[in-house]
Interface confidence: low
């Protein structure tokens, strides 16, 4: 393995991810790692000198850039919120605020808009499909022995509480939109009316 800076015949460096061809000196030089930028360009005798990106800037990849990219905050006006802050080697990670979903352009989430979601009524739940879609939700009734008591796009039907497991007895049966109500069993020897 050659150590930069080194001369090369065909202008193709050995490790193209971490090295680049510097035509001024006709040598292969080191790129700077993520989070750094070129502080001093290489020469025939000295390799690239890198330095950490200044505060509020970043470079995500191995590079021979003489600047770092300026960190951009997640744009609240466009409906984004910050998941992870900008660091010297990555830009801020943004996602849509709760209740909003992405509008994509060329595979990039350019802004967020309020979700126009179908709310599944109590007693129903959103049908689970392979496609992860936030729109065109199909609501289906809870299966027997299950209930769902909210108006929600994402709530799932839950199994009814089984009173006997808790040493209780059923006071009122569960429905598709309400849970079973349990009560303490009668005292032994108590008169049954």
């Amino acid at each position: 393995q050659l150590v930069p800076p080194y001369r090369i015949e065909n202008q193709t460096c050995w490790d193209q991810d971490k090295e680049y061809y510097e035509p001024m000196h006709d040598v292969c030089c080191s790129r700077c790692p993520p989070g750094e930028f070129v502080f001093a360009v290489c020469s025939r005798s000295q390799d690239t000198v890198c330095k950490t990106c200044p505060h509020n800037s970043y470079n995500e990849h191995w590079n021979h850039l003489s600047t770092c990219q300026l960190c951009r905050p997640c744009d609240i006006v466009l409906g984004f919120e910050e998941v992870a802050p900008c660091t010297s080697d990555r830009k801020a990670e943004c996602r849509c605020q709760p209740g909003m979903s992405c509008v994509y352009l060329d595979n990039e989430c350019v802004h967020c808009e309020e979700e126009r979601l179908v709310l599944c009524q109590p007693g129903t739940e959103a049908e689970v499909t392979d496609e992860i879609m936030d729109t065109d939700v199909n609501c289906v009734p809870c299966k027997p022995g299950h209930f769902q008591n909210t108006s929600s796009p994402r709530a799932r039907c839950q199994p009814h509480t089984r009173c006997e497991i808790q040493g209780l007895v059923e006071a009122a049966p569960g429905t598709s939109y309400s849970d079973t109500i349990c009560k303490n069993p009668p005292e032994p020897g108590a008169m049954l009316l």
Epitope: V38, F39, H55
Partner: antibody
Framework: QVQLVQSGAEVKKPGSSVKVSCKAS????????ISWVRQAPGQGLEWMGG????????NYAQKFQGRVTITADKSTSTAYMELSSLRSEDTAVYYC?????????????WGQGTTVTVSS | DIVMTQSPDSLAVSLGERATINCKSS????????????LAWYQQKPGQPPKLLIY???TRESGVPDRFSGSGSGTDFTLTISSLQAEDVAVYYC?????????FGQGTKVEIK
Amino acid sequence: QVQLVQSGAEVKKPGSSVKVSCKASGGTFSSYAISWVRQAPGQGLEWMGGIIPIFGTANYAQKFQGRVTITADKSTSTAYMELSSLRSEDTAVYYCARPSYYLDGWLDYWGQGTTVTVSS
Amino acid sequence: DIVMTQSPDSLAVSLGERATINCKSSQSVLYSSNNKNYLAWYQQKPGQPPKLLIYWASTRESGVPDRFSGSGSGTDFTLTISSLQAEDVAVYYCSQYYTTHYTFGQGTKVEIK
């Protein structure tokens, strides 16, 4: 050859503000951090803050935070340092300086200095 | 911020003799990625702005006489004037540029004995 030319001496009253300019010539202005360093009479060098015109963001020494504002006008290749709420201990020579390598390296170009006197 | 401490505060040396100035940083200014020390030395004469002498702790600025040399690594650095000349009377400062908040030592005044 890079040259940094600063504005002339100032006499100011306590509580007022002063704005010192530093005009750069003979180099790429935007690509280098311009630093401001001051020196009180008989004292050492004290870094106040700096600005990288290409980014437009300034950073300041903790001591001067909130009292100093450093700006840069790329169209005229001029950097400015404004110090507010002046007191007598701000009497000093104020220098602008910049590196010859990209961004924020050793300072090899210095302005001639601007004397600011704060006196009632 | 990184604190730079110089010693001594002042130094009187005979013409032609060696002058040694020390500088200590509160944290290392050696950058492991490139094995370089982000430390510079400046000379300042009365009524003049500082002049760069040394960068990368030991690299002489072009035009600086070779009687000036810098050494050290990590947190401990030295500026040596091997044979003091009359024109070397000045205040000398070390400075780190490891962080974007530059800091300077308090200065060492070099005089002729």
